[in-house]
Structure formats: structure tokens, C-alpha cells
């Protein structure tokens, strides 16, 4: 007996060939021996089976001795043994229809779990193997679970269902709702305008929700809400904003915040949360602000940084075109009685400059 695997909602063609390449009598029946379709004269006739409105045959191939049965919009309950009767012989085809669906919405928040459920005919014992867009392989039986979705799980999952050495492939599009980056750091000189951007890692036709940016300044004892906003069909509207600092927010996506100037008292880290309509949970993105200040006071040239910096970052003071430098893995460096000239304050990570500020030291006569 031939085994054919089908996918729920798809179309399948069950083939049946006569030895003689000519139009002849044929019938397709189900396992109850009830006629599904057949030929009467030159016409296709349909029996009263449940497939009456979904079964068809390629009339153009009849005179080639090919009497296939096409079943549209497959259902799990179409799984059955079908019998083709032609030229006094019977050909049996076992059709097994499978369905693979995500238990919840296919738009899930980062960190949420994804469960894929296999619908299968009674008596079948299929195995399922799924491959994520990032190449992660997961195996299972009736259900497949991915406990914590990551950003890279967004995209098309390819799942292969195997039964009786036959396979059928399902493609399921999963959208992980997250910001493009989990965390970002902005490095600015004191007084510069600061731009914070929070691009989303997905696109939705209608995007509605609300958000807030909480800020923990390095110098402050507690965090405070800097801004709250609404998102309606990708349009952003500010609900509430603090007086100090007075943030500005872009009206369109990606979410964009502007801090008029970087000041040491603002240096710190923030957490932008976005709650989407009809979704439980929130999207998060951490944002850090590092502010640099270079000052000369009397005979002391000082460079300082505020905000969340890694201990491995190097802060240096360097006189332009001269070898004289002072470097430290610290948040402040200084030079006493600096030489006249253009000094550079550099914040760097393994030789890569993250932030620089120039200060001119004038000679003292």
C-alpha cells in the first residue's frame, strides 16, 4: 500500500494509473467503500462522501490512463485509505494528513515560550524536527516547546514531520517582538545633544501600545520616569515628560528621544519599556549615557567620565603631536602643570576610541 503525507489546508494528488493509455471506467472510494468520484460516460461524477465538494480529477489526463484524485483544503479527518478501481484492479493509497500550528499567537515577546502542536490522524506515530531561523534544532512528538524565545528566533521555522519513511515539511513564521538591541550606550561630551534610538526588530501593520523611559542617574539615589508615551498605529504621542531633563520625542517610528544636552547629572542608565496592545508582557531596551568633561583649573588638567563604564575602559590625556600621555583604567585622569598645546581626552576600549574631547592649554607667563 502506498503512503502519502498531506498538510492540513493544502491540496494533495493521489495517483492511479491504468496500464492502457486510454479513457476507461474508474472509481475512487474511501475505506467505507463509498464512492468519492468516478467516470460516467465522459463526465466526472461525485458520490456522497465527505469529499464531494473538495475532490476532483484531471480530466485532461484520462486519455493517458491517468486517473488521479485531487483533494483540496485537506483536513485531518481526510486521513484514510483510498481505493482506486480501474481495469478490474484495485490500488490502495493511505493518506495521512498532518497539521502543525503554534499554540498561541505567532507574534511573541522575547523571553516568552513557543509551543508547536502537531495534529495527526489516530493511529499514526509521527516524529517532528524543527529548525529555527538561527539554525537551532529541536525534536519532539506531538508537541515541540521552545522555552525562551530569543531575538534570533524571529523568522521562518522549518519543521519536518516524518511517518513511515515519508516526510512533509511545514513552514511557520514566528515574529519575536523585541527591540533590535538589548542594550546600547551613547558616549557624549558635556553639552552635546544626545540622541537615543530604539529601533524595533519587527514590523507590524498596526502597532499600538504605551511606553515609558525610567532613568537611574549615577549621581541619584533612586530612578525616575523621564517620559511616558503612547503609540497608536505607529504614531507616537507624549503623555508626560519631566521638566529636568526636558526630553523630546519623535512622532514616528523608530522610537527616538532627544536630550538637549549631555550633563554629568544625567549620566547613568535607563530602561525603555514598551507594552503592546493585546500582548502580555513588555519589550525592554536598556540605554546607557556616558558623559565626558575635560577641564583646566589653575595648574590642573582633568578629564572625567560619568555613567556606566566597564572597568576595562581606558581614560587617557594626551598632548597632540607629543608622546606625553597619562592613561588609567579609571573614571578620572589628570595632569598637573600641563604643557601648553591641544590636549586630547580619550575614552577607549582595547585601542578603539569611544569618546574624545579636546581642550586647549594656554601657556602661563
Amino acid at each position: 500500500k502506498k503512503v502519502v503525507l498531506g498538510k492540513k489546508g493544502d491540496t494533495v494528488e493521489l495517483t492511479c494509473n491504468a496500464s492502457q493509455k486510454k479513457n476507461t471506467q474508474f472509481h475512487w472510494k474511501n475505506s467505507n467503500q463509498i464512492k468519492i468520484l468516478g467516470i460516467q460516460g465522459l463526465f466526472l461524477t461525485k458520490g456522497p462522501s465527505k469529499l464531494s465538494d473538495r475532490a476532483d480529477s484531471r480530466k485532461s489526463l484520462w486519455d493517458q490512463g491517468c486517473f488521479s484524485m485531487i483533494i483540496k483544503n485537506l483536513k485531518i479527518e481526510d486521513s484514510d485509505t483510498y481505493i482506486c478501481e480501474v481495469e478490474n484492479k484495485k490500488e490502495e493509497v493511505e493518506l495521512l494528513v498532518f497539521g502543525l500550528t503554534a499554540n498561541s499567537d505567532t507574534h511573541l515577546l522575547e523571553g516568552q515560550s513557543l509551543t508547536l502542536t502537531l495534529e495527526s490522524p489516530p493511529g499514526s506515530s509521527p516524529s517532528v524536527k524543527c529548525r529555527s531561523p538561527g539554525g537551532k534544532n529541536i525534536q519532539g512528538g506531538r508537541t515541540i516547546s521552545v522555552p525562551q524565545l530569543e531575538r534570533q528566533d524571529s523568522g521562518t521555522w522549518t519543521c519536518t514531520v516524518s511517518q513511515d519513511q515519508k516526510t512533509v515539511e511545514f513552514k511557520i513564521d514566528i515574529v519575536v517582538l523585541a527591540f533590535q538591541k538589548a542594550s546600547s550606550t551613547v558616549y557624549k561630551k558635556e553639552g552635546e545633544q544626545v540622541e537615543f534610538s530604539f529601533p524595533l526588530a519587527f514590523t507590524l501593520e498596526k502597532l499600538t501600545g504605551s511606553g515609558e523611559l525610567w532613568w537611574q542617574a549615577e549621581r541619584a539615589s533612586s530612578s525616575k520616569s523621564w517620559i511616558t508615551f503612547d503609540l497608536k498605529n505607529k504614531e507616537v504621542s507624549v503623555k508626560r515628560v519631566t521638566q529636568d531633563p526636558k526630553l523630546q520625542m519623535g512622532k514616528k517610528l523608530p522610537l527616538h528621544l532627544t536630550l538637549p544636552q549631555a550633563l554629568p547629572q544625567y549620566a547613568g542608565s535607563g530602561n525603555l519599556t514598551l507594552a503592546l496592545e493585546a500582548k502580555t508582557g513588555k519589550l525592554h531596551q536598556e540605554v546607557n549615557l556616558v558623559v565626558m568633561r575635560a577641564t583646566q583649573f589653575q595648574e590642573n588638567l582633568t578629564c572625567e567620565v560619568w555613567g556606566p563604564t566597564s572597568p576595562k575602559l581606558t581614560l587617557s590625556l594626551k598632548l597632540e603631536n607629543k608622546g606625553a600621555t597619562v592613561s588609567k583604567q579609571a573614571k578620572a585622569v589628570w595632569v598637573l602643570n600641563p604643557e601648553a598645546g591641544m590636549w586630547q581626552c580619550l575614552l577607549s576600549d582595547s585601542g578603539q576610541v569611544l569618546l574624545e574631547s579636546n581642550i586647549k592649554v594656554v601657556p602661563t607667563w
Epitope: 467503500q33 460516467q40 461524477t45 456522497p48 479527518e77
Partner: antibody, heavy 120, light 107 residues
Framework: QVQLQESGPGLVKPSETLSLTCTVS????????WSWIRQPAGKGLEWIGR???????NYNPSLKSRVTMSVDTSKNQFSLKLSSVTAADTAVYYC??????????????WGQGTTVTVSS | DIQMTQSPSSLSASVGDRVTITCQAS??????LNWYQQKPGKAPKLLIF???TLETGVPSRFSGSGSGTYFTFTIRSLQPEDIATYYC?????????FGGGTKVEIK
């Protein structure tokens, strides 16, 4: 056991639409075809068509242009609408269950029938 | 559509008589044939399916035979409660069609 009961107006004016409902009791409406058959007085039986619980239908070609069937699984009911009626549509209308099992296909449960007269 | 021709349209027989009704299909319908009994003022009742198989609870005096286009229905020994109209019905192809019926009366 499963019982069927037809309901609807006994008198319909010519050119109007005949509407009948069949209520299934004592069993589930799911996973069966449910059919309508009519019988003019002193005449034979005519299969009007059928509806599956998913909503898919098959109609008799002779009536197809005028027939609409629907199903309401939550109420365990299915319905028949026959538009543009004439006196020729006067008949006893039966609802029935079509049952398929091995080597078997038949209308095994019937309603008692309801008489519909088309007259002005 | 498949036409079903039943004959005779009516018959009168005595209690205990053997009664035979024939049904002819316009096309080969294999054994896809049912026989129904309809008593006056009642809904039809399925007696025989698959041309020759008796529905559960149907008395064994009823029988059916035939295949292809020609079928017969027999009441071996007519009883007073058998007064009814008998219909054949094909289920080979949609639309499902019935024969014109045979009215059986007691002499």
C-alpha cells in the same frame, strides 16, 4: 437517540422565501451531513440538498439557484431557505441525517415533516 | 443526474403473498442503492442499504438484490403492517435521487 424536528411557517406567499429550521436533539450535530427532502402531496421524494457541520453544501442542480442552507452548531440547528417560491414548491418538507459507515450510506434519521403551502 | 425508475407504481396483494418491486437506474450504480418504506402520514424509514443488506431491526421477510442498473426488492410474505409506499434511492452520485415509489396495498 437522535431526533429531528422541522419548524417554520406553514404558509408562504408566491415569490417569497420559504424558511425552515431543523433542530437536532438527543445527539450532536457535528460530523454529519444533514439533508432536506421534500414530497409534494401524493408524489415521490425529492432530495433538495445537504449541509455538513463545517458549512459545506451540496444542492440538487434543479433547485440550486434558489436554495441556501446554513448550520448553527451552537444551537444544534440547520436551516433551509428556498427563494422565489411558486405553487410547485407546495410539499411536505423533511429534514434527515445522512450517515456513512462501512458499505452504508443512507438517511437513517428523519424528522416527522412539515407541510408548506405556497399560496397568496 | 441518475434517473431511478421504479415499477409497478402500485400493487395490491394478499396477506402472505410474495411481493416484488423493481428499480432501474439510468447508469451503472454498482450496489449503491437503498430501499425505504414510508407509511401513510409518516417519514420514510431506511430498510435496506448496499442493495441487499438489511438495516438493524428490519424483519427478515424483506430482502433486496441486484447490482449495476437493475435491482429488486422483495417482501417474502406480505403482512398487514407492510402497507406503505416503497422507494429506491441511489447513492452512487450526487444529486441523490429516488425512484417514483411503489404503493403496496392489501387486497
Amino acid at each position: 437517540q437522535v431526533q429531528l424536528q422541522e419548524s417554520g411557517p406553514g404558509l408562504v406567499k408566491p415569490s417569497e422565501t420559504l424558511s425552515l429550521t431543523c433542530t437536532v436533539s438527543g445527539g450532536s450535530i457535528s460530523s454529519f451531513y444533514w439533508s432536506w427532502i421534500r414530497q409534494p402531496a401524493g408524489k415521490g421524494l425529492e432530495w433538495i440538498g445537504r449541509i455538513y457541520t463545517s458549512g459545506s453544501t451540496n444542492y440538487n442542480p434543479s433547485l440550486k439557484s434558489r436554495v441556501t442552507m446554513s448550520v448553527d452548531t451552537s444551537k444544534n440547528q440547520f436551516s433551509l431557505k428556498l427563494s422565489s417560491v411558486t405553487a410547485a414548491d407546495t410539499a411536505v418538507y423533511y429534514c434527515a441525517r445522512e450517515l456513512e459507515k462501512r458499505n452504508y450510506y443512507g438517511m437513517d434519521v428523519w424528522g416527522q415533516g412539515t407541510t408548506v403551502t405556497v399560496s397568496s | 443526474d441518475i434517473q431511478m425508475t421504479q415499477s409497478p407504481s402500485s400493487l395490491s396483494a394478499s396477506v402472505g403473498d410474495r411481493v416484488t418491486i423493481t428499480c432501474q437506474a439510468s447508469h451503472d450504480i454498482s450496489n449503491y442503492l437503498n430501499w425505504y418504506q414510508q407509511k401513510p402520514g409518516k417519514a420514510p424509514k431506511l430498510l435496506i442499504f448496499d442493495a441487499s443488506t438489511l438495516e438493524t431491526g428490519v424483519p427478515s421477510r424483506f430482502s433486496g438484490s441486484g447490482s449495476g442498473t437493475y435491482f429488486t426488492f422483495t417482501i417474502r410474505s406480505l403482512q398487514p403492517e407492510d402497507i406503505a409506499t416503497y422507494y429506491c434511492q441511489q447513492y452512487d452520485s450526487l444529486p441523490l435521487t429516488f425512484g417514483g415509489g411503489t404503493k403496496v396495498e392489501i387486497k
